[in-house]
């Protein structure tokens, strides 16, 4: 298949260190003319994160996703993996993206492969208009603080590119569950596709077990600290933006031709005091909070702002 | 304070269906995975699955593939696992636990129910 | 499906002791592993889990080695409380999978 221009349009300038393989549905490589090759995983919270492909775990994982896609197809399952070009869909993203991860999507004329787009249910988390991202720019996503005492190798720092669609009418990043979106704190815009008027609060959950290997795309999370879990129910110790608007009627028109550019900007903003106490033990952020997007029709563009996560800084206890 | 607190002992024939509770309080509900797990007598463990109250996309362990069903009702925060068409080797303790779910984390239990005795027997 | 073996099935100490545990799992799972203990008529708890780390109120005399596919759970100094069952966990890819388990007796 012809993609047209072949330009570098993902650019990972640093590597996640391990993910269990059971936590992700998905991978992907960047193009060649990246210079530095990255594998592109999508977990099953459909997030991207850059890896290495000559990390041991990476292969492990990339085939075990091999494997696991091919019993799939066996089994009339849907699961996906593309080798090759990661080139944008027609939807640009509204969800993290970080730490140098430049994004440039070409307008070839050609449906895109790569369509990163937040559900219609997340809550409107995104900041106005911002300088163009330099590669360089240090950004910080995702939501894991590592427990303590930890080994070397931290969680996934940094390393996260944006959330993809769990449902999308392109097929390329499509995994073998459909995604009932839960309450987060990714900027919400409009797409083609109907939203969910299920009330998350009142509908009782049903599942059972078709088949094996099933992706259970998941929202909310919890953070680490001092080698401890507790989970106060609504607890936040990281700076947290205030809730600015989304334009949520930038994706409607978007084209296969249509451009895309990624900015970031740092955020600065108070936090928030917890509701419960966070068990004996202090715990520290880590540079990995999600990044929330905004679009502007006019400039069609992709704003993309480093927030820490409400939901991802929930703790129990 | 985190608890799992699970429904009592239950006896069924063969072919069967049982349905256990696990009523979880100390955390929002609808953010952790809660995950099962089978311990036949004088055996070990074995996974059963996973679900994200909220989700409708669990998985499962390809041993129970059919079998099992996990529902969950928000209102109550309560989660069920149904096992169907029971046989005499299902009779065991049947555990709900959470794990994290920062995706890059991955799936440790660090809360537990206190299990609930299945027996199977005509 | 990845299979982890527990050595030894059983093992008799006494208090003060240092006992090891052994796990092998049958492919790499790359440190994503816990450790639980349990007791007669008991949940499991956790131990330890990803890289060695502790888990909350759990002793330092508990302890975690290993990588690729030999992991090991040490006790450096055993306690009366510590005479229980110890099992580990890979989740690095689902099925989610157990070791036999390891029963730790009193000599």
């Known amino acids: 298949q012809h993609h047209g221009v072949t330009k570098c349009n993902i650019t990972c300038s640093k590597m996640t260190s391990k993910i269990p393989v059971a936590l992700l549905i998905h991978y992907q490589q960047n193009q060649a003319s990246c210079g530095k090759r990255a594998i592109i995983l999508e977990t099953r919270q459909h997030r991207l994160f850059c890896a290495d492909p000559k990390e041991q775990w990476v292969k492990d994982a990339m085939q075990h996703l091999d494997r696991q896609a091919a019993a799939l197809t066996r089994n009339g399952g849907t699961f996906e993996k593309q080798i090759g070009e990661v080139k944008p869909r027609t939807t640009p993203a509204a969800g993290g993206m970080d730490e140098s991860v430049v994004l440039e999507p070409e307008a070839t004329g050609e449906s895109s492969s790569l369509e990163p787009t937040p559900s219609s249910q997340e809550a409107q988390r995104a900041l106005g208009t911002s300088p163009e991202l330099p590669t360089g720019v240090t950004g910080s996503s995702g939501t894991r603080l590592p427990p303590t005492p930890k080994a070397q190798d931290g969680g996934p720092v940094g390393t996260e590119l944006f959330r993809v669609p769990p449902v999308s009418t392109a097929a390329t990043w499509q995994s073998s569950a459909p995604h009932q979106p839960g309450p987060s704190l990714w900027a919400e815009a409009k797409t083609s596709e109907a939203p969910s008027t299920q009330d998350p609060s009142t509908q009782a959950s049903t599942a059972s077990s078709p088949a094996p290997e099933e992706n259970a795309p998941s929202e909310g999370q919890r953070v680490w600290g001092q080698g401890q879990s507790p989970r106060p129910e609504n607890s936040l110790e990281r700076e947290e933006m205030g809730p600015v608007p989304a334009h949520t009627d930038a994706f409607q028109d978007w084209g296969p031709g249509s451009m895309a550019h990624v900015s970031v900007v740092p955020v600065s903003s108070e936090g928030t005091p917890s509701r419960e106490p966070v068990a004996s033990g202090s715990w520290t952020p880590k540079a990995e909070e999600p990044i929330h997007a905004t679009m502007d029709p006019q400039r069609l563009g992709v704003l993309i702002t480093p927030v820490p996560d409400a939901q991802a800084a929930t703790r129990r206890q | 304070e985190v608890q799992l607190v699970q429904s009592g002992a239950e006896m069924k024939k063969p072919g069967a269906t049982v349905k256990i509770s696990c009523k979880a309080s100390g955390y929002t509900f609808t953010n952790y995975n809660i995950h099962w797990v089978q311990q036949a007598p004088g055996k070990g463990l074995e996974w059963m699955g996973w679900y994200l109250p909220g989700d409708d996309s669990p998985r499962f362990n390809e041993r129970f593939k059919g079998r099992v069903t996990i529902t969950a009702d928000k209102s109550t925060n309560t989660a069920y696992m149904e096992l169907s068409s029971l046989r005499s080797e299902d009779t065991a303790v049947y555990y709900c636990?959470?794990?994290?779910?920062?995706?890059?984390?991955?799936?440790?239990?660090?809360?537990w129910g206190q299990g609930t005795t299945l027996t199977v027997s005509s | 499906d990845i299979q982890m073996t527990q050595s030894p099935s059983s093992l008799s100490a006494s208090v003060g002791d240092r006992v090891t545990i052994t796990c092998r799992a049958s492919g790499r799972i790359h440190d994503f592993l816990a450790w639980y203990q349990q007791k007669p008529g008991k949940a499991p708890k956790l131990l330890l889990f990803t890289d060695n780390t502790l888990a909350e109120g759990v002793p330092s005399r508990f302890s975690g080695s290993g990588s690729g596919t030999d992991y090991t759970l040490t006790i450096s100094s055993l306690q009366p409380e510590d005479f229980a069952t110890y099992y580990c966990?890979?989740?690095?890819?689902?099925?989610?999978?157990f070791g036999g388990g390891t029963k730790l007796e009193i000599k």
């Open positions: 966990q890979q989740f690095w890819s689902t099925p989610y999978t």
């Open positions: 636990a959470t794990s994290p779910t920062d995706e890059t984390q991955g799936d440790y239990f660090d809360y």
